[in-house]
């Protein structure tokens, strides 16, 4: 079986499908211990499909955001673009590279007064549970012919987390995306690593619930850092501020 692969801590995910969420700062989804490609998913083949089409920032990688490739380009065609470094112009947080956020139209460094925890986690954890649009930027979405009159329950197909009922997020499962429960305290979560090591997970976890963050489990008996599990843990003394 693939359990041995599933139980390993995956590193990063290629973006999932149109209209959905992936492992991007601010994402609804945490890459689960998943099936990685290349290197073990004997059930999957994947063609080279760069650039990656997208409808939301969440579909793109950690160092990318979703936008039209040309200024004033076709609104219906958006792809994942490289994030913007410090002091570059921006319209929303996701446009800025990890460790930065968008303030007054410019990517600026995230400091500990504004964001809690490690720089690597700050944007994901500060904005991951906030599904509202940041900086007044209205996101363009891809509408399906299926209208979601009621919010999706566990196992329902979704395009984005807002399609799911409270306590659930939209995460990849096999070749679809479904509503899965947001993680509770003590549950295993997946920390997003820096860009590179492009694995494709076909299983994703949700983010940690309200008041929780994904941190290394404090276990002094672990032999090495690389084998340490991340779990959802209560915030410590850091204050939590949203930027609007």
């Amino acid at each position: 079986t693939l359990n041995s692969v599933l139980n390993s801590n995956a590193i990063k995910n290629l973006p999932p499908p149109l209209g959905g969420a992936a492992g991007h700062p601010g994402s609804a989804v945490s890459a689960a211990p998943g099936i990685l490609y290349p290197g073990g998913n004997k059930y999957q083949t994947i063609d080279n499909y760069q650039p990656y089409p997208c409808a939301e920032d969440e579909e793109c990688g950690t160092d990318e955001y979703c936008a039209s490739p040309t200024r004033g380009g076709d609104a219906g065609v958006q792809i994942c673009l490289a994030c913007r470094k410090r002091r570059k112009r921006c319209m929303r947080h996701a446009m800025c590279c990890p460790g930065n956020y968008c303030k007054n139209g410019i990517c600026v460094s995230s400091d500990q007064n504004h964001f809690r925890g490690e720089i690597e986690e700050t944007i994901t954890e500060s904005f991951g549970n906030d599904h509202s649009t940041l900086d007044g930027y209205s996101r363009r979405t891809t509408l399906s012919s299926k209208m979601y009159h009621t919010k999706g329950q566990e196992g329902s197909v979704c395009l984005r987390s807002s399609d799911c009922a409270s306590g659930l997020c939209c995460a990849r499962h096999f070749w679809s995306k479904i509503c899965k429960p947001v993680l509770k305290e003590g549950q295993v979560c997946t920390k997003h690593r820096r860009k590179g090591s492009h694995g494709l997970e076909i299983f994703q976890r949700c983010y940690c619930g309200e008041g929780l963050s994904c941190r290394i489990q404090k276990d002094h008996h672990q032999a090495s850092n690389s084998s340490r599990l991340h779990t959802c843990q209560r915030h410590h003394h850091h204050h939590h501020h949203h930027h609007h």
Epitope: T1, L2, N3, L6, P15, P16, P17, L18, G19, A32, I35, N41, Y43, Q44, T45, I46, D47, Y49, T142, S144, S145, K146, E154, G155, S156, V157, L159, A171, H173, F174, W175, S176, I178, K180, P181, L200, I202, F203, R205, C206
Partner: antibody, heavy 117, light 111 residues
């Protein structure tokens, strides 16, 4: 109304090839995963291949390297190219999709493939 | 891969009776807080029809007499009162792990 209509089945000799089609309607085809599932005569169901809305493809070992799933979103069509066919590939082939939940919640009526000399 | 074993192979009952079908998985099909077990009904010459997903949730348009229960490795499909149109073959299927696999089926026949 969601509809999936398979076609392309028939009699083929061992080692031969066949291309199955599935015409979809009633939903935004490009947004959803779609799969092939088969059923040998008098037997149970077996997953054959899937393609996601983001175009990656999946196969079990039994058909990998011989079958290729593909989709044409402009034509709302799914295909299964079957090469190096064997007697054990004889089955009714269904296309199925997952529109409302992760299971195979909508199915076509199937097309019959017979591999025999 | 996860192997699903259904029992009994054949169930002989009369209309109005309660049918209880079992499906056992070779390993747990629970993950992410969901039991990834589904049930399908298939009549001769027809395509399968989804009855239950996530162990206990009803598919669209499925009558209330069909219900599912269980978690981990043991699952049950219950038909509270058999209607004439319910005599068919029933398959369980797991979606926890690739490849998705089906059980061998239980035939519910008229006694």
């Amino acid at each position: 109304e969601v509809q999936l209509v398979e076609s392309g089945g028939g009699l083929v000799q061992p080692g031969g090839s066949l291309r199955l089609s599935c015409a979809a309607s009633g939903f935004t085809f490009s947004s959803y995963a779609i799969s092939w599932v088969r059923q040998a005569p008098g037997k149970g169901l077996e997953w054959v291949a899937s393609v996601s809305g983001w175009l990656d493809t999946y196969y079990p070992d039994s058909v990998k390297g011989r079958f290729t799933i593909s989709r044409d979103n402009a034509k709302n069509s799914l295909y299964l190219q079957m090469n190096s066919l064997r007697a054990e590939d004889t089955a009714v082939y269904y296309c199925a999709t997952s529109l409302e939940n992760y299971a195979f919640d909508y199915w076509g009526q199937g097309t019959t493939v017979t591999v025999s000399s | 891969e996860i192997v699903l074993t259904q029992s009994p192979a054949t169930l002989s009952l009369s209309p109005g009776e309660r049918a209880t079908l079992s499906c056992r998985a070779s390993e747990s099909v629970d993950d992410f807080g969901i039991s990834f077990m589904n049930w399908y009904q298939q009549k001769p010459g027809q395509a399968p029809r989804l009855l239950i997903y996530a162990a206990s949730k009803q598919g669209s348009g499925i009558p209330a007499r069909f219900s599912g229960s269980g978690s981990g490795t043991d699952f049950t499909l219950t038909i509270s009162s058999l209607e004439p149109e319910d005599f068919a073959v029933y398959y369980c299927q797991q979606s926890k792990e690739v490849p998705p696999t089906f059980g061998g089926g239980t035939k519910v026949e008229i006694k």
